[in-house]
Interface confidence: medium
């Protein structure tokens, strides 16, 4: 199916930035993988390069305001040809769940005190209001609540005096129309405006002001135009050569306003002065490798020695990663394809241990499915041998880190029954619907 | 051990509207998602319909979309298909399939097959024109 692409994909936003155009297959537009398309407009955007997996969205906000509840977030697999880790296609959505709590109390409505006194008119003439008051201790609210109502009321007084009304001028009229719209008539135009006293009105019992300045006012037309032209579009111009050598480009033809050119005010000509096209030069653009991961440490050995596991003998170990990815004459992936350290080995030796904190509570599993729990560990954690933390293996290449490596056998005195792991669980609260944002939006 | 068995298939006439179930024992119907897919004589298998473990949300094929309804009823362990404006090109075996990861969601996820642990054996629907 044709889609809509794009040149360039926003990794912060997730959105698709400047379009080249569309009717154009997903396997053209990702000749360049650092095109990105859309199936529809306003719809998903996927970025040509390999699939990986976004950012994860900001916490959605808690399901509850006050207590405990819980709130979701969630991250997209976005890429087009193969898979996010977990064999997870484009387009899926993975999602956490927590737990949360706003507010620990939940608000408590107060009470009205009773009325207090009536304040004086709020005029000394004519009708106005007064007030009184009332305060919200009777009792107090709690935990941000309120009391039910209003805090004043109000109602009508009459002073039983008129009031003088003062003249106020109502807005200008517009202006007269000049006699000529072009310059060069035979009179010079001029223009004139008018204002009425009667907003409102002085009274004459009691007597009111009346309204300062004059009632009209007149000026010349100054800068009346010459007449316009309107200006016409010139032929369209060559096409301009296709500006990439990669993937899908876009050329562009221009044509000038100047058949002819508008003058004295007169109108530009309309439409566009330029209009582009879409190139295809059927070359796929160069790919650059990238680091896989690390691989595992390789166990720690030493030369010559059939184990130093429990000893105090440092070894050496290695790990190696991929460049994968390269292609089409790309850049090859930089920095070292090997890393080597100093070790000593642990792996399967007896340590003495003890019992960690607790951990902080994990996250509430599963995040979409029913009954999400979370739950919080206490391991029995080894207590490492104090051997020197640097060594010097080759005379005069100074001294070396020397990491502790392999999976011991930690013993601690039994807690709960347990000898490695305590665990505890809870259920998650008010658990919120994983949906997806892009459906929400139509 | 773990039984998903479908029913309601038969031959229709073309624009005629037929209703397949799909009945789940041996596993916690309530925690999964479930799927209808099809497959047509010497075609691959298609995706249809899908339809989350709560049921608030629904997926359909855009070949199947506004005619067909799915839907489940977590009390009686299982899932429906509603077919109406039946045409020709709708025959095919259906099969109904069960999702247990509840960490994933989106069309993109649902309508790839691998993705489900448990498949019925299918029901025959044929239309007539």
């Known amino acids: 199916d044709p889609v809509l692409c794009f040149t360039q994909y926003e990794e912060s936003s997730g959105k698709c930035k400047g379009l080249l155009g569309g009717g154009v297959s997903v396997e053209d537009c990702c000749l360049n993988t650092a095109f990105a398309y859309q199936k529809r407009s306003g719809g998903l955007c996927q970025p040509c390069r390999s699939p990986r997996w976004s950012l994860w969205s900001t916490w959605a906000p808690c399901s509850v305001t006050c207590s405990e509840g819980s709130q979701l977030r969630y991250r997209r697999c976005v890429g087009w040809n193969g898979q996010c880790s977990g064999k997870v296609a484009p387009g899926t959505l993975e999602w956490q769940l927590q737990a949360c709590e706003d507010q620990q109390c939940c608000p408590e409505m107060g009470g009205w005190s009773g009325w207090g006194p009536w304040e004086p008119c709020s005029v000394t003439c004519s009708k106005g209001t007064r007030t009184r008051r009332r305060a919200c201790n009777h009792p107090a609210p709690k935990c941000g609540g309120h009391c039910p109502g209003q805090a004043q009321e109000s109602e009508a007084c009459d002073t039983q005096q008129v009031c003088p009304t003062h003249g106020a001028w109502a807005t200008w009229g517009p202006w007269t129309p000049c006699s000529a719209s072009c310059h060069g008539g035979p009179h010079e135009p001029k223009e004139t405006r008018s204002r009425k006293c009667s907003a409102p009105e002085p009274s004459q019992k009691p007597p009111g002001k009346p309204c300062p300045g004059l009632a009209y006012e007149q000026r010349r037309c100054t800068g009346l135009p010459p007449c316009p032209v309107a200006g016409g579009w010139g032929p369209w111009g060559p096409v301009s050569p296709c500006p990439v050598t990669c993937g899908l480009g876009q050329t562009m033809e221009q044509r000038t306003c100047n058949h002819p050119v508008p003058q004295h005010g007169g109108p530009f000509c309309a439409g566009d002065a330029t209009r582009t096209h879409i190139c295809n030069t059927a070359v796929p653009c160069p790919v650059d490798g990238e680091w896989d991961s690390w691989g595992e440490w390789s166990p720690c050995i030493r030369r010559n020695m059939k184990s130093i596991s429990c000893q105090e003998i440092p070894g050496q170990q290695s790990r190696g990663r991929t460049c994968r990815g390269r292609k089409f004459d790309g850049h090859r992936c930089a920095g070292q394809q090997q890393d080597i350290r100093h070790c000593y080995s642990i792996q399967h030796c007896p340590l003495k241990g003890s019992w960690s904190e607790w951990s902080t509570w994990g996250l509430c599993m599963p995040p979409c499915g029913p009954n999400p729990t979370r739950a919080r560990q206490r391991l029995c954690t080894p207590l490492l041998p104090k051997y020197p933390p640097t060594v010097s293996m080759v005379e005069g290449q100074g001294e070396k880190n020397v990491t502790f490596w392999g999976r011991p056998l930690p013993r601690c005195e039994e807690l709960q029954g347990q000898k490695l792991v305590v665990e505890e669980k809870r259920p998650c609260l008010h658990v919120p619907a994983c949906k997806d944002p892009e459906e929400e939006e139509l | 051990q773990v039984q998903l068995v479908e029913s309601g298939g038969g031959l229709v006439q073309a624009g005629d509207s037929l209703r397949l179930s799909c009945a789940a024992s041996?596993?916690?119907?309530?925690?999964?998602?479930m799927g209808w897919f099809r497959q047509a004589p010497g075609k691959e298998r298609e995706f249809v319909a899908a339809?989350?473990?709560?049921?608030?949300?629904?997926y359909y094929a855009d070949s199947v979309k506004g005619r067909f309804t799915i839907s489940r009823d977590n009390a009686k362990n299982r899932v429906y298909l509603q077919m109406n404006s039946l045409k020709p090109e709708d025959t095919a075996v259906y099969s109904c399939?069960?999702?247990?990861?509840?960490?994933?969601?989106?069309?993109?996820?649902?309508?790839?097959?691998?993705?489900?642990?448990?498949w019925g054996q299918g029901t025959q629907v044929t239309v007539s024109s």
């Open positions: 041996g596993f916690t119907f309530s925690s999964y998602a």
């Open positions: 399939a069960a999702d247990g990861s509840g960490r994933y969601s989106g069309m993109e996820y649902y309508n790839r097959d691998w993705v489900y642990d448990y």
């Open positions: 339809i989350t473990w709560s049921g608030v949300s629904t």
